[in-house]
């Protein structure tokens, strides 16, 4: 799994007039990390684990970055020509990643009223636009504005790519939290399914980092993919993750089945409770 930093900013307009303020959330490695507090005009950590990432450092830099990005996005929304009556939103999602082989990725996506209309691979500058004519029109509008703006201010999206990666590296280097290993708690449960069958579910929770193998085995051999159901690996709000895998088995054969878990080089097997 790559390490990632994801910025999600939204600005609003009402009857063609761009509203002051903006909404902003930042995710680090898929976990809610920061949000912009509009009352205090500050970037605020989301929970204890986020505070632990930077330790005793202030969030001034993050506040400054989010404020600048919000201002830029408001200017972009002001240049969208087809704003009709009522409420409209412009959302920008920006993601940068550092992969295990040290290669990097950086992308940027724009949504108008919740609909994707423009994406950019920031490193290569490749833009992609969905096929719809509305997306094409919006994309041309926004790209022209961004092009003009970049020429005027002499700033470029490569700087944004570099900033995002720089921040991500800073968090990774300064944070013991992001280098930690938290083994999962594994819990196996059973429930009646249909006549003669039971559903067995294996849950792994409170683990870090995100990469995990969780699978059912019969007589020590992994079951095929299509006989198992997997849940997504989701953040649990505490800077750790949770997931599950389930399968249906014949009642009376429970002792033949085990849940196999592998995480950060450690593995364990867990029987079905009788």
């Amino acid at each position: 799994e790559p390490h990632s930093l994801r910025y999600n900013l939204t600005v609003l307009s009402w009857d063609g007039s761009v509203q002051s303020g903006f909404l902003a959330e930042v995710h680090l490695d898929g976990q809610p990390f920061l949000r912009y507090d509009r009352q205090k005009c500050r970037a605020k950590p989301q929970g204890q684990w986020a505070e632990d990432v930077l330790g005793n450092k202030t969030w001034d830099r993050e506040t400054r970055d989010l404020t600048g990005n919000g201002k830029d996005l408001r200017m972009t929304l002001a240049h969208i020509k087809d704003q009709k009556e009522g409420l409209h939103s412009l959302q920008e999602i920006r993601v940068c990643e550092i992969h295990e082989d040290n290669s990097t990725r950086s992308s940027q996506h724009f949504y108008y009223d919740g609909e994707l209309f423009l994406s950019q691979n920031v490193e290569t500058e490749e833009w992609t636009v969905p096929q719809s004519s509305r997306a094409q029109t919006l994309a041309m509008n926004v790209r022209n504005f961004l092009k003009e703006d970049a020429m005027k201010t002499k700033t470029h999206y490569h700087a944004m790519h570099a900033d995002c990666l720089q921040e991500l590296r800073r968090y990774l280097e300064s944070s013991v939290v992001l280098r930690r290993r938290v083994p999962p708690m594994v819990n196996v449960t059973r429930s009646e399914a249909s006549e003669g069958n039971i559903t067995v579910t294996c849950r792994a929770s409170s683990f870090y980092p995100r990469n995990i193998t969780l699978t059912w085995r019969q007589d020590g051999v992994s079951l095929s993919h299509d006989t198992q159901q997997w849940g997504d690996v989701l953040p649990d709000g505490n800077g750790t993750y949770q997931t599950w895998v389930a399968t249906r088995i014949c009642q009376g054969e429970e002792q033949r089945f085990t849940c196999y878990m592998e995480h950060s080089g450690n593995h364990s097997t867990h029987p079905v409770p009788s």
Partner: antibody
């Protein structure tokens, strides 16, 4: 109809600089896309060398970084390749191509490095 | 850099048969930045499939592409004589852009 055409000397001496130009017709190189140089040594596969983007940004293959320069002449709608300190290993067919999924290519020009 | 490995290196088939060419990457690639090319002797490569599964202009429907992450496939449903050529995969996710080493599709 978009067309790309490479031009430049077919023979370069070792240690000298290889210079090629790609002339684009039917599309402005400042409108969009990356404008790439790709080469293919005899009997071998394709190697991406680098590009100049519509915005003027250049990106190079790290394997060539110390020797390669790609520039553009927007008034002539051309972009150029310079590769310094060439050796026999730089003998190849050189292509210019448009885009990221390379949708338009020049026909290629053979460059031989030999004394 | 992302290394792309194509398999097989050579594929010997007869006209009318189905061809399946594979391309494997050392690091995950976004499917919108993955493309296939066809090259015939003495010619420049030609874009065949862009963004994993979209046919380039003028390419017949017997060609199709699929895949995601680190594994991609080019399929030719029923080979025509003009399909015998070298096929290259290419990624544009990250710099440097890279090509696979090529699969030569030859007549059996």
């Amino acid at each position: 109809q978009v067309q790309l055409q490479e031009s430049g000397p077919g023979l370069v001496k070792p240690s000298e600089t290889l210079s090629l130009t790609c002339t684009v017709s039917g599309y402005s190189i400042t409108s969009d896309y990356a404008w790439n140089w790709i080469r293919q040594p005899p009997g071998k596969g394709l190697e991406w060398m680098g590009f100049v983007s519509y915005s003027g940004t250049t990106k190079y293959n790290p394997s060539l970084k110390s020797r390669i320069t790609i520039s553009r002449d927007t008034s002539e709608n051309q972009f150029s390749l310079k590769l310094s300190s060439v050796t026999a290993a730089d003998t190849a067919v050189y292509y210019c191509a448009r885009g990221y999924g390379f949708d338009y290519w020049g026909q290629g020009t053979t460059v031989t490095v030999s004394s | 850099e992302i290394v792309l490995t194509q398999s097989p290196a050579t594929l010997s088939l007869s006209p009318g048969e189905r061809a399946t060419l594979s391309c494997s990457a050392t690091s995950s690639i976004s499917s919108i930045y993955f493309h296939w090319y066809q090259q015939k002797p003495g010619q420049a490569p030609r874009l065949l499939i862009y963004r994993t599964s979209n046919l380039a202009s003028g390419i017949p429907a017997r060609f199709s592409g699929s895949g995601s992450g680190t594994s991609y496939t080019l399929t030719i449903s029923s080979l025509e004589p003009e399909d015998f050529a070298v096929y290259y995969c290419q990624q544009g996710t990250t710099i440097p852009f890279t090509f696979g080493q090529g699969t030569k599709l030859e007549i059996k």
